[in-house]
C-alpha cells in the first residue's frame, strides 16, 4: 500500500483550511479521549479511479468520498483519519486530514474527497473514514467502513495500468490445444516481443475430479527477435492413463518486468463426450 504523488496532497476547500498528514493509524484521541466528539461520516463512497503519476505512469486508486452530517457536532470536528486495509495481508495505510480552521455550517453540505491511495489489481480492501477526535471508549462509533474489490488485470480498463502492464497484461497468447493420436497434445501460442523463456505447465485430471493424475513441465527457450509475435508449437506426450482425460495447459512467461511473477494464461481440454445412450443389452446372456 502506498500513496500516489505524495507532494500533491490537498484537503483545503473554500471555508476550510486543511492539511493532509501521514498517520500511524493510532490517533492521539484514542489515548486521550475527549468529552465532546463529532458524529460519524455520512454517505461514504469508494470508487475505482485511475490516476497518472508525474512520471506518466497510470495507477488504479481508491477514490474516497464522504459528507458530514448536519448536526451541531460539526463544531467539534477536528479532522478525519482515512484508513485503507488490504484484507489478504492485513497491511494498513492511513492519512489524517487536519482541520486548521473551525468548520461552520454553510449553504451546502460539506463534502470531502481523497484519491491518493494506490490499490493493486485483484485485491480487496476495507476503507474506513474516522472523524476526529475518536469517541470515548463506550461512545457511539463515529466511523464508516466499506469493502472494495479491485478488478484483476484481465479487466479492459485495468489491463493498461502500469502494474498490469508490468506483469505482462498486454500479451495475448491466444492458446490453442488439440488432442492428437497416440496420447499427445499439440499446444500453440503467440510469443511476445521479448527475448525471454516460457514454461508450459500441463496438469491432467480425471473426468469429474479435481485431483491431478498427471503433471508435466516443458521449457521453451527464449525466441529470437525474428520469432517475436510468431506462433510457437509444442507437442506434449501424455501418460497413458485411462480416464486421465481433462487437461489444463498453463503458459508462464518470464518477462523482464515481472520475472517469475508474470500473469499466466491457461486453456483447458475437456474429456471427450460420453455417448448419451447406453450400450444395448443383448436379448440373452450366454453362460459361457
Amino acid at each position: 500500500l502506498r500513496l500516489l504523488d505524495h507532494r500533491a496532497l490537498v484537503c483545503s476547500q473554500p471555508g476550510l483550511n486543511c492539511t493532509v498528514k501521514n498517520s500511524t493509524c493510532l490517533d492521539d484521541s484514542w489515548i486521550h479521549p475527549r468529552n465532546l466528539t463529532p458524529s460519524s461520516p455520512k454517505d461514504l463512497q469508494i470508487q475505482l479511479h485511475f490516476a497518472h503519476t508525474q512520471q506518466g505512469d497510470l495507477f488504479p486508486v481508491a477514490h474516497i468520498e464522504w459528507t458530514l452530517q448536519t448536526d451541531a457536532s460539526i463544531l467539534y470536528l477536528e479532522g478525519a483519519e482515512l484508513s485503507v486495509l488490504q484484507l489478504n495481508t492485513n497491511e494498513r495505510l492511513c492519512v489524517r486530514f487536519e482541520f486548521l480552521s473551525k468548520l461552520r455550517h454553510h449553504h451546502r453540505r460539506w463534502r470531502f474527497t481523497f484519491s491518493h491511495f494506490v490499490v493493486d489489481p485483484d485485491q480487496e480492501y476495507e476503507v474506513t473514514v474516522h472523524h476526529l477526535p475518536k469517541p470515548i471508549p463506550d461512545g457511539d462509533p463515529n466511523h464508516q467502513s466499506k469493502n472494495f474489490l479491485v478488478p484483476d488485470c484481465e479487466h479492459a480498463r485495468m489491463k493498461v495500468t502500469t502494474p498490469c502492464m508490468s506483469s505482462g497484461s498486454l500479451w495475448d497468447p491466444n492458446i490453442t490445444v488439440e488432442t492428437l493420436e497416440a496420447h499427445q497434445l499439440r499446444v500453440s501460442f503467440t510469443l511476445w516481443n521479448e527475448s525471454t523463456h516460457y514454461q508450459i505447465l500441463l496438469t491432467s485430471f480425471p473426468h469429474m475430479e479435481n485431483h491431478s493424475c498427471f503433471e508435466h513441465m516443458h521449457h521453451i527457450p527464449a525466441p529470437r527477435p525474428e520469432e517475436f509475435h510468431q506462433r510457437s508449437n509444442v507437442t506434449l506426450t501424455l501418460r497413458n492413463l485411462k480416464g486421465c482425460c481433462r487437461h489444463q495447459v498453463q503458459i508462464q512467461p518470464f518477462f523482464s518486468s515481472c520475472l517469475n511473477d508474470c500473469l499466466r494464461h491457461s486453456a483447458t481440454v475437456s474429456c471427450p463426450e460420453m455417448p448419451d445412450t447406453p450400450e444395448p443389452i443383448p436379448d440373452y446372456m450366454p453362460l459361457w
Partner: nanobody, 127 residues
Framework: EVQLVESGGGLVQPGRSLRLSCAAS????????MHWVRQPPGKGLEWVSG????????DYADSVKGRFTISRDNAKNSLYLQMNSLRAEDAALYYC????????????????????WGQGTMVTVSS
Amino acid sequence: EVQLVESGGGLVQPGRSLRLSCAASGFSFDDYAMHWVRQPPGKGLEWVSGITWNGGRKDYADSVKGRFTISRDNAKNSLYLQMNSLRAEDAALYYCVKERSLGYCSGGSCSDAFDIWGQGTMVTVSS
C-alpha cells in the same frame, strides 16, 4: 440510454424454482460488477447477491445462500438469478442493479455504490 430490464418473475409454489434475467444496454456491461436487490412488500430494500465483472467472485446474503445462484453472460449483456427452493419470505420485487464504479462493493452498505436500477420484476411465492 443506460437501461436494465428485468424479467422472469411470477407466481410460484414454495419449494419450486424460478430464473430471473436482466438485459443491460447503453453501457459496457462487461466492465461492471452487478447485483440483485429485493424489496419485500411493505419492507425496505435487501441486498441479495453480487457478481464481479467477469463472474470471478459471487456473494450472497445469508438468507439465500445455497439456494440462489447469480451468473452473467457478458456476450449477451445479461445477468441472471437462479432461485431454487423458494420460500414465502422470498416474495419481493427483485431489482437488477449496476455498480457506479469499476470496482466491486464487497462489504458494508452498498446501496449508494449503485447508480442504475431496473424497474424490477415481481416474485410471488404462494401455495
